[in-house]
């Protein structure tokens, strides 16, 4: 199809060689009320037709993306040629940075419903450059964490070294939707909830004497709980004595709850106390039996092939520890009567 009638947008992706980042292109086809630009070669902006023929943005999952080879070859279907680029509804996701992503990307509706729609397309000229200036050493990361329940902020990586006063107007998107009230280089969140997690995009315009570009950066925001201030607690065993039958096999389970820690090195082990002696027991691997955002429940069993008289004189101790501290629970075996 003829792409000369497509509207054109220029975008710049300056990526950091230090970090993994993603990038997105939105298929910015016009909404029905603005759709006259799709067929501007037929109508002036004032001559809006009685029924607007373009399908509008509510059906933008049905768009086709192409790349225009620089050598003038025919347009290539993105899905067939570029495994590191994913189409999700009307968004094109670039999973890896690199100058080889530079080029022209075209999107248009899959369903051409009227002659007007033929020219309803957007051509995005993407320039990709590695970040060169080391002047801004502490630029914001493309992966930012927000602490649940507290105040936080999301910074636009490409503008994070500029003060709010000198920052240009920024357009923000969250999960592909425009955040119309946000115009600064930083989004301030008064209280962080789970729904603040997502993919944020910040755009601003950079102009020179020749042309203007949209500078875009993508930020993956996740909401996290703060590191626990508590040592782990033992959920099982609860009792400090356990009735057993001599000569029978026995499994004692130790289950402990560990609060969230970004650097998580839990310890859960069994040891035996016998009068003045104490030794660690070789037991099966610890395993997580529940995993939530706030805590991890880990279980470790001690297995006795058969309970002996000697075992009744011993204490079996479960020891659990995180970076805050440790907790123990001891169990004394008692012969079952009758």
């Amino acid at each position: 199809f003829n792409i000369s009638g497509c509207s054109t947008k220029k975008l710049l992706w300056t990526y950091s060689t230090r970090s993994e980042e993603e990038f997105v292109l939105f298929c910015d086809l016009p909404e029905p009320q603005k759709s006259h630009f799709c067929h501007r070669n037929r109508l002036s902006p004032k001559q809006v037709p009685e029924h607007l023929p373009f399908m509008g943005s509510n059906d933008l999952s049905d768009v086709q993306w192409y790349q225009q080879p620089s050598n003038g070859d025919p347009l290539e279907d993105i899905r067939k040629s570029y495994p590191h680029i994913i189409q999700d509804k009307c968004t094109l996701h670039f999973l890896t940075p690199g100058v080889n992503n530079s080029g022209s990307y075209i999107c248009r509706p899959k369903m051409i419903k009227s002659p007007y729609d033929v020219a309803c397309c957007v051509k995005m000229i993407l320039e990709v450059k590695p970040q060169t200036n080391a002047s801004c050493e502490y630029s914001a990361s493309h992966k930012q964490d927000l602490l649940l329940g507290s105040t936080g902020s999301i910074s636009c990586p490409s503008l994070s070294c500029q003060s709010d006063a000198q920052s240009p107007a920024v357009t923000w998107y969250k999960n592909g939707k425009l955040l119309s009230v946000e115009r600064s280089n930083r989004i301030v969140v008064d209280e962080v909830y789970d729904y603040h997690q997502g993919t944020y995009v910040c755009d601003y315009t950079q102009s020179d004497t020749v042309s203007s570009w949209t500078v875009r950066a993508v930020v993956q925001v996740r909401t996290i709980v703060g590191d626990t201030k508590l040592k782990p607690d033992i959920l099982d065993p609860v009792e400090d004595t356990l009735e057993v039958e001599l000569g029978k096999p026995l499994t004692i389970s130790c289950k402990a709850r560990f609060g969230f820690e970004r650097v998580f090195n839990p310890v859960i082990k069994w040891y035996i106390k016998d009068s003045d002696l104490e030794w660690e027991v070789s037991v099966p691997e610890a395993k997580s039996i529940k995993s939530t955002l706030k805590d991890e429940i880990i279980e470790r069993n001690i297995i006795l092939e058969k309970v002996t008289q000697r075992d009744l004189r011993r204490k079996f101790v479960c020891f659990v520890q995180n970076s805050i501290g440790n907790t123990t629970q001891s169990v004394q075996l008692k012969e079952k009567r009758g």
Epitope: E285, K287, S288, I289, K290, S291
Partner: nanobody, 115 residues
Framework: DVQLQESGGGLVQAGGSLRLSCAAS????????MGWYRQAPGKQRELVAD???????NYADSVKGRFTIFRDTAANTVTLQMNNLKPDDTAVYYC?????????WGQGTQVTVSS
């Protein structure tokens, strides 16, 4: 830090078999969930199969009866036995574990099924 190392990918003809393995290191316990996802060119990452501690398994409809997942809790490994492979199974296969309700991923291993 948790590291996930996949192996066993490769090129195979339709109807053939492959066995993918993944070992988790840098972790002192067996994670709640271990499993496999895959991503075909231009598509979203999707679940293939996973297994929770205690043994319950979950398979994508498209692989049921053809793929089998195994876990070795002591060694912190997860294995995917893939039989009767189809061209549609061509993708990068990623090992996946869950800690604090969040996913960690391996680098991926390419599986290509030719017709």
């Amino acid at each position: 830090d948790v590291q996930l190392q996949e192996s066993g990918g490769g090129l195979v003809q339709a109807g053939g078999s492959l066995r993918l393995s993944c070992a988790a290191s840098g972790i002192t316990f067996s994670p709640y969930v271990m499993g496999w996802y895959r991503q075909a060119p231009g598509k979203q990452r999707e679940l293939v199969a996973d297994m929770v501690n205690g043994g319950s398994t979950n398979y994508a409809d498209s692989v049921k009866g053809r793929f089998t997942i195994f876990r070795d809790t002591a060694a912190n490994t997860v294995t995917l036995q893939m039989n009767n492979l189809k061209p549609d199974d061509t993708a990068v296969y990623y090992c996946h574990i869950m800690i604090f309700g969040r996913a960690s991923w391996g680098q991926g291993t390419q599986v290509t099924v030719s017709s």
